[in-house]
């Protein structure tokens, strides 16, 4: 058993049929010595008396809010949560496996630049009695500070018969050094509590590996005289690190016809303009990627090719 | 050229070669995200690798103030990786494919280090840790880790030279 936060405790249980469970001793936080009784949740059934209560925690029915009273007055609470371990593996029932970029990916994180600011998100089908708490640091043995905000519900989607909820959190490295080569990864830890179930999820990454620039901005077309060629121009996204002579992007320009079957023409360039051929009903799209490190491409910025 | 005396490097040449290094490093080990090498207990490799750190003056302001500190750090790293790529880790079994970009990568590391420090000038270099994995699978894993680490190193070096070519060239 360990303390998650004040008056909230996590009991780690090996979860299998007829498991013995864990013996837990609860102590009433009071200077009083006698006349103390214990109850669980809203029940008025007295579970025991005395300053301490010893219980055998085997299942979710044994978890919950234990309260010690004296003469009708509440003295203190202890909330017991369960953390299940099945076949040596901690349960991951609360969050959905996003399977990207690999299986058992519960947390996904992205950064728009090298400023040390990043966003993580996760998915669940659970809609109520759910809380998250997020902590982060740079490195684990001698951790350097990363400050995370509160996790918030950022999107709701219908997936077949189920509703899916996306939560996200923003974090900022306290003393970020955008130009340095990272040697210690960022660690992100998410505590998830659903009713009386506790789970924790972690992710470890370098900012450079989760970079995904915003799409190029101000995408414009300038037709060339007596030609179906156009000069496409764009600008670096506002959110990208500066100066651009140092934090450079490379770009992919694509001409895509109306039908997905039509062949795509693609041009790669380090410049912020390119000359391409417009086809009927085509659109021109541009996306960006760090020029020197192959992290994710941005989403496409698109304009119709007319 | 970046020499201990403090003259400027051939920024544009360095920019071109460092960008080529980035391309080669990624073609030598293109897998991103498929194999989380940090799960494989790699402290003995990466702890000894010379990283370009915050105080090394490789940021735009530091380069403007005095690019020598940064260039020396980059030079150390280039020599370090050049020696690693020429070591038994890469020359031993399992043999690299004949068309592997590692050979070109090795040559380009040497080329860039020579651009930064011509014959007759010496910056101190870092000792190469003795990494001699016994099993071919360990050697393969170590190659991946070294290449991942090299990708990060050359990315910073390429940014430095791109910025230098754009803002510090005479």
């Amino acid at each position: 058993i360990w303390e998650l936060k004040k008056d909230v405790y996590v009991v780690e249980l090996d979860w299998y049929p007829d498991a013995p469970g864990e013996m837990v001793v609860l102590t009433c936080d009071t200077p009083e010595e006698d006349g103390i009784t214990w109850t669980l949740d809203q029940s008025s059934e007295v579970l025991g008396s005395g300053k301490t209560l010893t219980i055998q925690v085997k299942e979710f029915g044994d978890a919950g809010q234990y309260t010690c009273h004296k003469g009708g007055e509440v003295l203190s609470h202890s909330l017991l949560l369960l953390h299940k371990k099945e076949d040596g593996i901690w349960s991951t029932d609360i969050l959905k496996d996003q399977k990207e970029p690999k299986n058992k990916t519960f947390l996904r994180c992205e950064a728009k630049n090298y400023s040390g600011r990043f966003t993580c998100w996760w998915l669940t089908t659970i809609s109520t009695d759910l809380t998250f708490s997020v902590k982060s640091s740079r490195g684990s043995s001698d951790p350097q500070g990363v400050t995370c905000g509160a996790a918030t519900l950022s999107a709701e989607r219908v997936r077949g018969d189920n509703k899916e909820y996306e939560y996200s959190v923003e974090c900022q490295e306290d003393s970020a050094c955008p130009a340095a080569e990272e040697s210690l990864p960022i660690e992100v830890m998410v505590d998830a509590v659903h009713k009386l179930k506790y789970e924790n999820y972690t992710s470890s990454f370098f900012i450079r590996d989760i970079i995904k620039p915003d799409p190029p901005k101000n995408l414009q077309l300038k037709p060339l005289k007596n030609s179906r060629q156009v000069e496409v121009s764009w600008e670096y996204p506002d959110t990208w690190s500066t100066p651009h002579s140092y934090f450079s992007l490379t770009f992919c320009v694509q001409v895509q016809g109306k039908s997905k079957r039509e062949k795509k023409d693609r041009v790669f360039t380090d410049k912020t303009s390119a000359t391409v051929i417009c086809r009927k009903n085509a659109s021109i799209s541009v996306r960006a990627q760090d020029r020197y490190y192959s992290s994710s491409w941005s989403e496409w910025a698109s304009v119709p090719c007319s | 050229r970046a020499v201990p005396g403090g003259s400027s490097p051939a920024w544009t040449q360095c920019q071109q070669l460092s960008q080529k290094l980035c391309t080669l490093a990624w073609s030598a080990h293109p897998l991103v995200g498929h194999m989380d090498l940090r799960e494989e207990g790699d402290e003995e490799t990466t702890n000894d690798v010379p990283h370009i750190q915050c105080g090394d003056g490789c940021d735009p302001q530091g380069l403007r103030d005095n690019s020598q500190f940064c260039l020396q750090r980059i030079h150390q790293g280039l020599i370090f990786y050049e020696k690693l790529l020429g070591s038994d880790i890469f020359t031993g079994e399992p043999s690299l494919l004949p068309d592997s970009p590692v050979g070109q990568l090795h040559a380009s590391l040497l080329g860039l280090s020579q651009l930064l420090q011509p014959e007759g000038h010496h910056w101190e270099t870092q000792q190469i840790p003795s990494l001699s994995p016994s099993q071919p699978w360990q050697r393969l894993l170590l190659r991946f880790k070294i290449l991942r680490s090299l990708q990060a190193f050359v990315a910073v070096a390429a940014r430095v030279f791109a910025h230098g070519a754009a803002t510090l060239s005479p």
Epitope: L224, N226, S227, N281 | -
Partner: antibody
């Protein structure tokens, strides 16, 4: 910039015929080329085109009857099995724009070559 | 697509104005992929107007084009004897196979 059609002659129905348009002064890798015909005393009919990248398009009535192909300096129109209805002057015309759409304006035009199909 | 030209023939007096209409059975590509041609007997057609209203190089300014979508007009203001010819419109569409010429309008100058 010039175009000249050749290959027009008198043929019997069903005898395959290939017309050739020879171009000079511009590159077929940057221009779309069209074939148009005109029956005696009648209007213009667009047959089909080959675009700068080698893609072809045909009028719905012409599909299966005509095939357009090109080399670096020539554009061919093959008439698979001519009928008397195919008697006409055949023109080749360049797309006006560099990298023109099919259906863009045609300019310049060749002088035309006459095909007569008769038994 | 079917392009219908009206009227035909049309007679004009020197110095007068001639208006030829071209109606398309479907909207041309981007509302303006329509061109006009002049053809004299024994000659290939000559481009006059492209993109519905842009005058081709070397074409006298008495020729003008207008219209959008499915309805287009070629106007000859201050007709001259040399303008006696047959005029054709050509439409381009989303589907390349729909490319087609109008039936032609013969202009007779009296």
């Amino acid at each position: 910039q010039s175009l000249e059609e050749s290959g027009g002659r008198l043929v019997t129905p069903g005898t395959p015929l290939t017309l050739t348009c020879t171009v000079s002064g511009f590159s077929l890798s940057t221009y779309t080329m069209n074939w148009v015909r005109q029956s005696p005393g009648k209007g213009l009919e667009w047959i089909g085109a080959i675009s700068y990248d080698g893609g072809t398009a045909y009028a719905n009535w012409a599909k299966g009857r005509f095939t357009i192909s090109k080399t670096s300096t020539t554009v061919d129109l093959q008439i698979a099995s001519p009928t008397t209805e195919d008697t006409a002057t055949y023109f080749c015309a360049r797309g006006f724009y560099v990298y023109a759409y099919i259906g863009d304006a045609f300019d310049p035009w060749g002088p035309g070559t006459l095909v007569t199909v008769s038994s | 697509a079917v392009l219908t030209q009206t009227p035909s023939p049309v007679s004009a007096t020197v110095g007068g104005t001639v208006t030829i209409k071209c109606q398309s059975s479907q909207t041309v590509y981007k509302n303006n992929l329509l061109s006009w041609y002049q053809q004299k007997p024994g000659q290939p057609p000559k481009l006059l107007i492209y993109l519905a209203s842009t005058l081709a190089s070397g074409v006298p300014s008495r020729f003008s084009g207008s219209g959008s979508g499915t309805q287009f007009t070629l106007t000859i203001s201050g007709v001259q004897c040399d303008d006696a010819a047959t005029y054709y419109c050509l439409g381009g569409y989303d589907d390349d196979a729909d490319t087609a010429f109008g039936g032609g309008t013969e202009v007779v100058v009296v």
